[in-house]
Interface confidence: medium
Amino acid sequence: RDKVMSEFNNNFRQQMENYPKNNHTASILDRMQADFKCCGAANYTDWEKIPSMSKNRVPDSCCINVTVGCGINFNEKAIHKEGCVEKIGGWLRKNVL
């Protein structure tokens, strides 16, 4: 179980690196973030560490109310602050593992 979670964490972070470069990856992460109401791996600040992502931006799928461009110049109050690894991991533990 712990190994699966560790792999999921590493994979999620790897996909974040590819987010700005790969539309397919972006759509998968966007779907995860929107469906699970989460943002980033540990939390939304993870997006700051992606070199090709603008410093003032998170994906629009992080927004509580998703609209085009809502992730630009984001306010913490308007985005999901929980990380996806913990949130999706909890769901996996409950329903799959």
């Epitope: 700051e48 410093k55 461009g69 809502c70 630009i72 110049n73 984001f74 306010n75 913490e76 109050k77």
Partner: antibody
Framework: QVQLVESGGGLVKPGGSLRLSCAVS????????MNWIRQAPGKGLEWVSY????????YYADSVKGRFTISRDNAKNSLYLQMNGLRADDTAVYYC????????????WGQGTLVTVSS | DIQMTQSPSSLSASVGDRVTITCRAS??????LNWYQQKPGKAPRLLIY???NLQSGVPSRFSGGGSGTDFTLTISSLQPADFATYYC??????????FGQGTRLEIN
């Protein structure tokens, strides 16, 4: 009504330190990012630093990076700017500014506090 | 960093005149452009946000336009209270936000 009141400015020698404070009232402080913006005498406006609602995110202008530190105390509705290694070109009026983010602009500014760096 | 260039840097006009100030960004900033008015010894005041939205309490003689790289601030009929310095500011790349150098509007 919304109020932002800066304090802590004054005359300091080059290499010295100063801590600016900004007391805010009239709005839910934790709903907003906050900024420091400065204006040298007779010059234009220069963004200095911002801090996010919770304090998790902080950014600085290249001109002050490594010398200035922004912080906030949400329990006290206060914003701070610790300025170390002050130089003559840091002389300016420093404004505490509310930032709604997105494309809304800086909607409320304090009256400013003057920092003079001179020997 | 995104550079903001205002023109003209100073402008003389008379009460009742229509005045336009322009602001150009070094790259596209969509509509993330704001305008401020500053009077001597006072803090700047937000006039227009998002390129064309009038801030609450600002007279309707002020209007903003443009998107991408080119923007304008127009005062339809100058009033004595309008003589001041005007700044544009982009918040698309934030940090750092950047301001134009200012346009000083003087009485002719």
């Amino acid at each position: 009504q919304v109020q932002l009141v800066e304090s802590g400015g004054g005359l300091v020698k080059p290499g010295g330190s100063l801590r600016l404070s900004c007391a805010v009232s009239g709005f839910t402080y934790t709903d907003y990012f906050m900024n420091w913006i400065r204006q040298a005498p007779g010059k234009g406006l220069e963004w200095v630093s911002y801090i996010s609602n919770s304090g998790a995110i902080k950014y600085y202008a290249d001109s002050v990076k490594g010398r200035f530190t922004i912080s906030r105390d949400n329990a006290k509705n206060s914003l701070y700017l610790q300025m170390n290694g002050l130089r003559a070109d840091d002389t300016a009026v420093y404004y505490c500014v509310r930032d709604p983010r997105s494309y809304y602009g800086f909607d409320y500014w304090g009256q400013g506090t003057l920092v003079t760096v001179s020997s | 960093d995104i550079q903001m260039t205002q023109s003209p840097s100073s402008l003389s006009a008379s009460v009742g005149d229509r005045v336009t100030i322009t602001c150009r960004a070094s790259q596209s900033i969509s509509n993330f452009l704001n305008w401020y008015q500053q009077k001597p010894g006072k803090a700047p005041r937000l006039l227009i946000y998002g390129a064309s939205n009038l801030q609450s309490g600002v007279p309707s003689r002020f209007s903003g336009g443009g998107s991408g790289t080119d923007f304008t601030l127009t005062i339809s009929s100058l009033q004595p209270a309008d003589f001041a310095t005007y700044y544009c500011q982009q918040s698309f790349s934030n940090p750092p936000v950047t301001f134009g150098q200012g346009t000083r509007l003087e009485i002719n």
